[in-house]
């Protein structure tokens, strides 16, 4: 004969646990039904009646099967430096992520607590490691034979143009100036790993190899070349 199926609420066998999507109610000492995502327990079960569930109100949610008396509040609206990548529904919290050009400097369980603008490398410095959703740009000094004349969170150090005749040698923040009208380049200017140009040398020495470079952030300073504003919170 098939085993008898118990309907909630029911008293569990000694030493056994309640089934999936059920919970043990200490007061009633019974296995009772959980409420589905998007609902909460309006009335707890008794020995004779099962849990009564009700839908979450606006701006509240439950993501899991539960028996909570009240739904959780959705997080506050996304701040100006964030975009809403998941809306607040009865079954899920709002998720805010940093908008383009920003990264998450301090994460929370879901989404971001603190967004900050990506670092901009100043002239003479190029991007060594690009920013990601969770990490800042890393800048490095342009090595001999390369330059960057921009303030940018994306521009790398580019090779100096190779001149037939050099009018002004290039340096870390300036390209070489040629006297001839048709300079040649050994490779595309945007290429990252390039051979050193032969006829123009930078007027500075090779930077020391920097250790483990990785993401970094932005920085509100009380003075200075107005680095990006300090991050803003997402809750």
């Amino acid at each position: 004969l098939p085993a008898q199926v118990a309907f909630t609420p029911y008293a569990p066998e000694p030493g056994s646990t309640c089934r999936l999507r059920e919970y043990y109610d200490q007061t009633a000492q019974m296995c009772c039904s959980k409420c589905s995502p998007g609902q909460h327990a309006k009335v707890f079960c008794t020995k004779t009646s099962d849990t009564v569930c009700d839908s979450c109100e606006d701006s509240t949610y439950t993501q899991l099967w539960n028996w909570v008396p009240e739904c959780l509040s959705c997080g506050s609206r996304c701040s100006s430096d964030q975009v809403e990548t998941q809306a607040c529904t009865r079954e899920q919290n709002r998720i805010c992520t940093c908008r383009p050009g920003w990264y998450c400097a301090l994460s929370k369980q879901e989404g971001c607590r603190l967004c900050a603008p990506l670092r901009k490398c100043r002239p003479g410095f190029g991007v060594a490691r690009p920013g990601t959703e969770t990490s800042d740009v890393v800048c490095k000094p342009c090595a001999p034979g390369t330059f960057s004349n921009t303030t940018s969170s994306t521009d790398i150090c580019r090779p100096h143009q190779i001149c037939n005749v050099v009018a002004i040698p290039g340096n870390a923040s300036m390209d070489a100036v040629c006297t001839s009208t048709s300079p040649t380049r050994s490779m595309a200017p945007g290429a990252v790993h390039l051979p050193q140009p032969v006829s123009t040398r930078s007027q500075h020495t090779q930077p020391t190899p920097e250790p483990s470079t990785a993401p970094s952030t932005s920085f509100l300073l009380p003075m200075g070349p107005s680095p990006p504003a300090e991050g803003s919170t997402g809750d």
Partner: antibody, heavy 121, light 107 residues
């Protein structure tokens, strides 16, 4: 108000270890790069170590490379310097400093009050 | 490493006088140079960054200038609170070295 408060200094024998901490407040800690700078008894300043805001990129001066480790805990707003195989020439006042925002804003804009490390037998 | 040669090492001046402290770098550092002031028993404080820009709250009698690999800090009409030690530093390639300092004493 930006505050950087160092602790953990003291007297240690050559070859010994010491851990410095720097508790930060008054700014968004996780968005700033930080460094340790020391000042010798002769009043010379020496940059020791740097860590970027994400805690992944670290640079060291040659004099401490392999012996000192800089780290940070962005959840606790704290910067650390683990010092091992200490030498008499490591004797100095150690400052926790904010910056540089390397490649963008290249300077130390806030300094702590310092903690004294003395390496002597 | 880049060597920062700061001069003079010390000097004694009176209130109202003008002083220029120089820092010569062993190679180009592309203006990545701050100046700091340190008073007795205190931590250094940022005065100038990017060789010529005054930090917030720094009086206009302070000014920074550069010429090639020589960087200068000028203080016009010295005030009593200006006495202390001044340091230059570079932020080009690591290690980021400091000058030896200039101790400015009151005469």
């Amino acid at each position: 108000e930006v505050q950087l408060q160092e602790s953990g200094g003291g007297l240690v024998q050559p070859g010994g270890s010491l851990n410095l901490s720097c508790a930060a407040s008054g700014f968004a800690f996780s968005t700033y790069d930080l460094s340790w700078v020391r000042q010798t008894p002769e009043k010379r300043l020496e940059w020791v170590a740097y860590i970027n805001n994400g805690g992944i990129s670290t640079y060291y001066s040659d004099t401490v490379k392999g012996r000192f480790t800089i780290s940070r805990d962005n959840a606790k707003n704290t910067l650390y310097l683990q010092m091992s195989s200490l030498k008499s020439e490591d004797t100095a006042m150690y400052y926790c400093v904010r910056g540089p925002f390397y490649g963008s804003a290249n300077y130390f804009d806030y300094w702590g009050q310092g903690t004294t490390v003395t390496v002597s037998s | 490493e880049i060597v920062m040669t700061q001069s003079p090492a010390s000097l004694s001046l009176s209130v109202g006088e003008t002083v220029t402290i120089t820092c010569r770098t062993s190679e180009s550092i592309y203006s990545n140079l701050p100046w700091y002031q340190q008073k007795q028993g205190k931590s250094p404080q940022l005065l100038v960054y990017d060789a010529t820009k005054l930090a917030e709250g720094v009086p206009s009698r302070f000014s920074g200038s550069e010429s090639g690999t020589q960087y200068s800090l000028k203080i016009n009409s010295l005030q009593s609170e200006d006495f202390g030690t001044y340091y230059c530093q570079h932020f080009w390639v690591t290690p980021w070295t400091f000058g030896g300092g200039t101790k400015l004493e009151i005469k």
